[in-house]
């Protein structure tokens, strides 16, 4: 499924996104802007063997399983494949293991470069939530 | 316990297309990538790439790309690939994988002739 | 792509014989480098995972070893039906690739 702007702004703020770390929801958004175009079966395969999954592009190295990435962690304890419903659940509860993990949103190659420090608010602006 | 099932020989003409499957049994079909492989005699064997059946998303080696399109339906546990505009130089065996990284599981290869 | 180059090309083994088969990678790979058997008419059948590991149901006469750019299977004391080709593969990057195989043959 690829969301509208404001439907995952909704639907992230429903699953406790807003504000959760010290990130407001317009950091979110941002990041599964620049991550996966707001789309929720994005894949993209990495020089190190492991492969980003969904609207987040969480990794498979650390924090899901995809029964192929050497050395994998799993820490969220879900098939990499969950991460790929168009229901967000799987995602957001992983993401939220993520950003508590010390490194916060930095976690996310594309907020670090594209969103922080950036009027993150834009990307709510408009919404009814 | 798993395995994949591919379906039989092929004898087809120059330019015509065709599709291969191989069913999964055993596992969730939706959490693993499906992988598909060529042998030729003499050519050893080449990865055509790969699709992750829960989501559609697929891989294809460059060598491959506009040759082979994967699909996969989840309601049937079974993943496909479709040969088109073949030429001789398709005539081979075509195994269907389980992702693995390492491919523990392989099925038992669809052979494929291509000839007039 | 990443090049795997076997070696060699074949190997001609009395049973009973221990032997060494050779993989070498055109740039290094860790240990994302597998081995398989294949008979004639018959799948592939992974031996060795991840250049150590033995597989699940492979006898232990069955050994790998190797890092980075040069890899080993070794067979101790072979058997008959040991006899076949052999195959590594890496999964380091994209595309998989394959080495070209050695045949194992009887002497």
């Known amino acids: 499924k690829v969301f509208g702007r404001c439907e995952l702004a909704a639907a992230m703020k429903r699953h406790g996104l807003d504000n959760y770390r010290g990130y407001s929801l317009g950091n979110w958004v941002c990041a599964a802007k620049f991550e996966s175009n707001f789309n929720t079966q994005a894949t993209n395969r990495n020089t190190d063997g492991s492969t980003d999954y969904g609207i987040l592009q969480i990794n498979s190295r650390w924090w899901c399983n995809d029964g192929r990435t050497p050395g994998s962690r799993n820490l969220c304890n879900i098939p990499c494949s969950a991460l790929l419903s168009s229901d967000i659940t799987a995602s957001v509860n992983c993401a939220k293991k993520i950003v508590s993990d010390g490194n916060g949103m930095n976690a996310w190659v594309a907020w670090r470069n594209r969103c922080k420090g950036t009027d993150v608010q834009a990307w709510i602006r408009g919404c009814r939530l | 316990q798993v395995q994949l099932q591919e379906s039989g020989a092929e004898v087809m003409k120059p330019g015509a297309s065709v599709k291969i499957s191989c069913k999964a049994t055993g596992y969730t079909f939706t959490t693993y990538w499906i992988e598909w492989v060529k042998q030729r005699p003499g050519h050893g064997l080449e990865w055509i790439g790969e699709?992750?059946?829960?989501?559609?998303?697929?891989y294809y080696n460059e060598k491959f790309k506009g040759k082979a399109t994967f699909t996969a339906d989840t309601s049937s546990n079974t993943a496909y690939m479709q040969l088109s505009s073949l030429t001789s130089e398709d005539s081979a065996v075509y195994y269907c994988?389980?992702?693995?990284?390492?491919?523990?599981?392989w099925g038992q290869g669809t052979t494929l002739t291509v000839s007039s | 792509d990443i090049e795997l180059t076997q070696s060699p090309a074949t190997l001609s083994v009395t049973p009973g014989d221990s032997v060494s088969l050779s993989c070498r990678a055109s740039q290094s790979i860790s240990n994302n480098l597998h081995w398989y058997q294949q008979k004639p008419h018959e799948s592939p059948r992974l031996l060795i995972k991840?250049?150590?590991q033995r597989a699940s149901g492979i006898p232990s006469r069955f050994s790998g070893s190797g890092s980075g750019t040069d890899f080993t299977l070794s067979i101790n004391s072979v058997e008959t039906e040991d006899f076949g080709m052999y195959f590594c593969q890496q999964s380091n990057s994209w595309p998989r690739t394959f080495g070209g195989g050695t045949k194992l043959e009887i002497k």
């Open positions: 991840y250049a150590s």
């Open positions: 699709i992750l059946p829960g989501s559609g998303s697929t």
């Open positions: 994988a389980r992702g693995d990284g390492n491919y523990c599981y």
